[in-house]
Amino acid sequence: LPKAPVITTPLETVDALVEEVATFMCAVESYPQPEISWTRNKILIKLFDTRYSIRENGQLLTILSVEDSDDGIYCCTANNGVGGAVESCGALQVKMKPKITRPPINVKIIEGLKAVLPCTTMGNPKPSVSWIKGDSPLRENSRTAVLESGSLRIHNVQKEDAGQYRCVAKNSLGTAYSKVVKLEVEVFARILRAPESHNVTFGSFVTLHCTATGIPVPTITWIENGNAVSSGSIQESVKDRVIDSRLQLFITKPGLYTCIATNKHGEKFSTAKAAATVSIAEWSKPQKDNKGYCAQYRGEVCNAVLAKDALVFLNTSYADPEEAQELLVHTAWNELKVVSPLCRPAAEALLCNHVFQECSPGVVPTPIPICREYCLAVKELFCAKEWLAMEEKTHRGLYRSEMHLLSVPECSKLPSMHWDPTACARLPHLDYNKENPKTFPPMTSSKPSVDIPNLPSSSSSSFSVSPTYSMT
């Protein structure tokens, strides 16, 4: 006899993990055999879809490999034309082991700021997220909190927050661990010990101390009267994130010395400064008969020519002696680019030693002029042709600038080394190398070791000593 369909096994809720099998059963009793159709979220399932399996005339629906998107309400409907269609529904809950979808990353943060280490998770049931610092579970406190998203927020980051972190996502199906990440706490540069001011006598040595800390360890630079310190020796040591810098100075003039501690935070820098003055006892202005003072050469042009830490005479008739004298050599130096290779090093040596004369410190700082013999060696041996050309230009008034004339000495007016060997300065660049006559050895001391060669006789010569100039 015909019998309307009756569902004898109503659908139940099915839990399945992603990639697992999920089966719904809809056992039907009826005569004739019913047609059974299936829907998911009220949309008909196409039974030829290879992701599904149908058994026993549609009474078993199997999803062969569950995906996230299979979650929903499944209904079976049975109809055999006798009576009405019958339906039963059940849910598929796609369960998922915890998965960390946005893991934490290494973070560098400045002390006092807020740090957030991300840890976004997926899973069903929703995973709980906890954090591990080093080897121990992280305890939440007034500054640290695990957000709803799973991310770790640290307010007012402190040095002790630095370390290795990982997040742990847990649900009833399993546990997932993120990779270990590093939280690095950076600290602005800070001066722990500022340099002290000194009042010293002219020509004495002073050591200025500056100690700084920070993460990363800062670098220390010294500034003298607004410019980078070019003379003096700097010694540094680093211990336990503390840098100690000592600047040793030979004092020839008063100055303001600034210690600058700098460290880098990404693209930005943090800086801390401390300053000290060094004054000279009984130093007012240079006395009336005192035309200048001694100081270490801090320029650039004559760096290779003058001795390292050379004490040079700075002429106070200029408002800014260092700048004015440097400008003098700079101007003349550019013109030397066109002279012969034989002349150029000799002329450069003469130029620098003439403009920046060696200085004898004392109560009255005194410039030491170049020895006449060296000046003549440049004029008549190394640069004879160039010197003549220059004098011609001068006679014809082609040099309008006084500056140029100031940078060229008049050899005849210079003292001879035969009168008083200490009264004039020698040019070691002109010391003759017997193995290679064209070589100008690097300057080592202010005392030449070899004789200068014979100079050609010249009618314009303004000196009456023998043609061989003895240099020893």
């Epitope: 096994t9 139940e12 099915v14 839990d15 399945a16 993990l17 697992e20 099998v21 089966t23 059963m25 056992a27 055999q33 399996s53 149908i54 058994r55 026993e56 005339n57 009474q59 078993l60 199997t62 062969l64």
Partner: antibody, heavy 121, light 107 residues
Framework: EVQLVESGGGLVKPGGSLRLSCAAS????????MAWVRQAPGKGLEWVSS????????YYADSLKGRFTISRDNAKNSLYLQMNSLRAEDTAVYYC??????????????WGQGTLVTVSS | DIQMTQSPSSLSASVGDRVTITCRAS??????VNWYQQKPGKAPKLLIY???TLQSGVPSRFSGSGSGTDFTLTISSLQPEDFATYYC?????????FGQGTKLEIK
């Protein structure tokens, strides 16, 4: 009374072919899903393949796909298993079984006596 | 495929003993589990279906339980005719799989 009788077993060389048959009686064959299950000597049971009453739904064990073919002839109440490219590891007793929808899932409620297939050179 | 892991693989017991055989599925399979008994040289026989329902004609000393992934077949008081090999089988997936079997021997 449900009856299932297998035939077609025997000795075959590796690489050879064999066709097994199962004659069914005592139930509505065309409405029943049928299956083949095998058992290697001294080993456990292994499901081979199933076919629905209307032959629309056919399943194979992954390890056998491509070499074995299940089919049925409802007019003759017969189930078949065509076995090609036979290997030594296919040596087993092959059972024909009826699948039945149970309270939960399906089970093999009726079995044949089995037919022995020996693959050896 | 869903794997069915049966234990123990063999078991010695005496008549009158209570015996338990377990079967674990590699994923949750609700109650889609059947138990079979097979005697040497014979075809398997369905004992229990849907994890706990006794097939008609099977003595009541046989019982089944479990859901999800863990299932149990229990023989409350062994009889001489019960010495055989027992198999579990899942039908949750259309690619059916059996456990490797438990051989129940007389002690």
């Amino acid at each position: 009374e449900v009856q299932l009788v297998e035939s077609g077993g025997g000795l075959v060389k590796p690489g050879g072919s064999l066709r097994l048959s199962c004659a069914a009686s005592g139930f509505t064959f065309s409405a029943s899903t049928m299956a083949w299950v095998r058992q290697a000597p001294g080993k456990g049971l292994e499901w081979v393949s199933s076919v629905s009453g209307d032959s629309h739904h056919i399943y194979y064990a992954d390890s056998l796909k491509g070499r074995f073919t299940i089919s049925r002839d409802n007019a003759k109440n017969s189930l078949y298993l065509q076995m090609n490219s036979l290997r030594a590891e296919d040596t087993a007793v092959y059972y024909c079984a009826r699948e039945r929808l149970l309270r939960l899932g399906v089970g093999f409620d009726s079995w044949g006596q089995g037919t022995l297939v020996t693959v050896s050179s | 495929d869903i794997q069915m892991t049966q234990s123990p693989s063999s078991l010695s017991a005496s008549v009158g003993d209570r015996v338990t055989i377990t079967c674990r599925a590699s994923q949750r399979i609700s109650g889609f589990v059947n138990w079979y008994q097979q005697k040497p040289g014979k075809a398997p026989k369905l004992l229990i279906y849907a994890a706990s329902t006794l097939q008609s004609g099977v003595p009541s000393r046989f019982s089944g339980s479990g859901s999800g992934t863990d299932f149990t077949l229990t023989i409350s008081s062994l009889q001489p005719e019960d010495f055989a090999t027992y198999y579990c089988q899942q039908s949750y997936s259309p690619l059916y799989t059996f456990g490797q079997g438990t051989k129940l021997e007389i002690k």
